[in-house]
Amino acid sequence: ELCDDDPPEIPHATFKAMAYKEGTMLNCECKRGFRRIKSGSLYMLCTGNSSHSSWDNQCQCTSSATRNTTKQVTPQPEEQKERKTTEMQSPMQPVDQASLPGHCREPPPWENEATERIYHFVVGQMVYYQCVQGYRALHRGPAESVCKMTHGKTRWTQPQLICTGEMETSQFPGEEKPQASPEGRPESETSC
């Protein structure tokens, strides 16, 4: 089931899904001056089963001036540099996404895609948080959030992460950064 909202925002931190659960949607969005091709897909969907999942549909953008011209999905290096996402630019630890059954990898960029990717997650999705450059992590627990179903409603768990400026002193002296593995917490659904 779709999560009604996004993972919680942590000041000076970004989140990243290491892999996307089957059922996740990614909006097909184009950058300014470009539009979806005529009859182009509205979104990509991670489909499949526990053994193999892949992204259904393809996002394609075309110049607003030339509405019907199809642009192929080949990323331009200079465009990729300018693309920001709400997620982290580099994963916190190497993860073999293909080894996670029922999950899809990060979809490859498409030409002239929007600067921010908007994913719609499903129950059981886990995302990992990392402080942005110039800030360091103070952990009280796992720096991750899971979308859970409770009493028929979806909610994200609160990540136990505080990002502090490099010059600030730790509020949690002696606290060590936990080694969070991608399967570190079960993707459980709570029922009532």
Partner: antibody, heavy 115, light 107 residues
């Protein structure tokens, strides 16, 4: 809870314009498209267009391109639709609805065009 | 534009019945088919998206199936609260288009 609260019923004269609103709550407004859908009495549903409140990017059904203008105000989490040059054909219930798969709908706002 | 056709505009059923409502697209829509329920007061709810995925909070008696151009919505054990009009909608490409609706009534 996700909620979309539409403005009240509108009575307008032919040739006039109306602007209806849709106040969103219970989710991050800028992360979901906002669609608008028309339903004439006793008839089916017609998609008018959508706006991405984050970027103000809009897409319209060609049929409504010159009729509807979609806008959004991030600060108040409110989407708007203005209908211009009203005729009796524009008398209908208009719904705002959010999302990629259009998962939550407003209660509908009735527009009546009459002289 | 893709045309969506619901050939049955109204159908009568009894409590506990298994009801199937069908929908046909004018071209292959690759499973990007949603089902909506509209109550007599105008309230619209998403029931199923992408052919068979149940939206949160929707009772499990609702199910969807189909592929290519032909799709169906099944209510396995009809309840009084299911009396409504049901619309299919293709959500693959713009403009999203709706079927004409099937009004479900009690016998």
């Amino acid at each position: 809870d996700v909620q979309l609260q539409e403005s009240g019923a509108e009575l307008a004269k032919p040739g006039a314009s109306v602007k209806m609103s849709c106040k969103a709550s219970g989710y991050t407004f800028t992360r979901f498209w906002m669609h608008w859908v028309k339903q004439r009495p006793g008839q089916g549903l017609e998609w008018i267009g959508y706006i991405n409140p984050s970027t103000d990017y809009t897409e319209y059904n060609q049929k409504f391109k010159d009729k509807a203008t979609l806008t959004a105000d991030k600060s108040s989490s409110t989407a708007y639709m203005q209908l211009s040059s009203l005729t009796s054909e524009d008398s209908a219930v208009y719904y705002c609805a959010r999302g990629t798969v259009v998962d939550y709908w407003g209660q509908g706002a009735t527009v009546t065009v009459s002289s | 534009d893709i045309q969506m056709t619901q050939t049955t505009s109204s159908l009568s059923a009894s409590l506990g019945d298994r009801v199937t409502i069908s929908c046909r697209a004018s071209q292959d829509i690759s499973n990007y088919l949603n089902w909506y329920q509209q109550k007599s007061d105008g309230t619209v709810k998403l029931l199923i998206y992408y052919t068979s995925r149940l939206h949160s909070g929707v009772p499990s008696r609702f199910s969807g199936s189909g592929s290519g151009t032909d799709y169906s919505l099944t209510i396995s054990n009809l309840e009084q609260e299911d009396i409504a009009t049901y619309f299919c909608q293709q959500g693959n490409t713009l403009p999203p288009t709706f079927g004409g609706g099937t009004k479900l009534e009690m016998k």
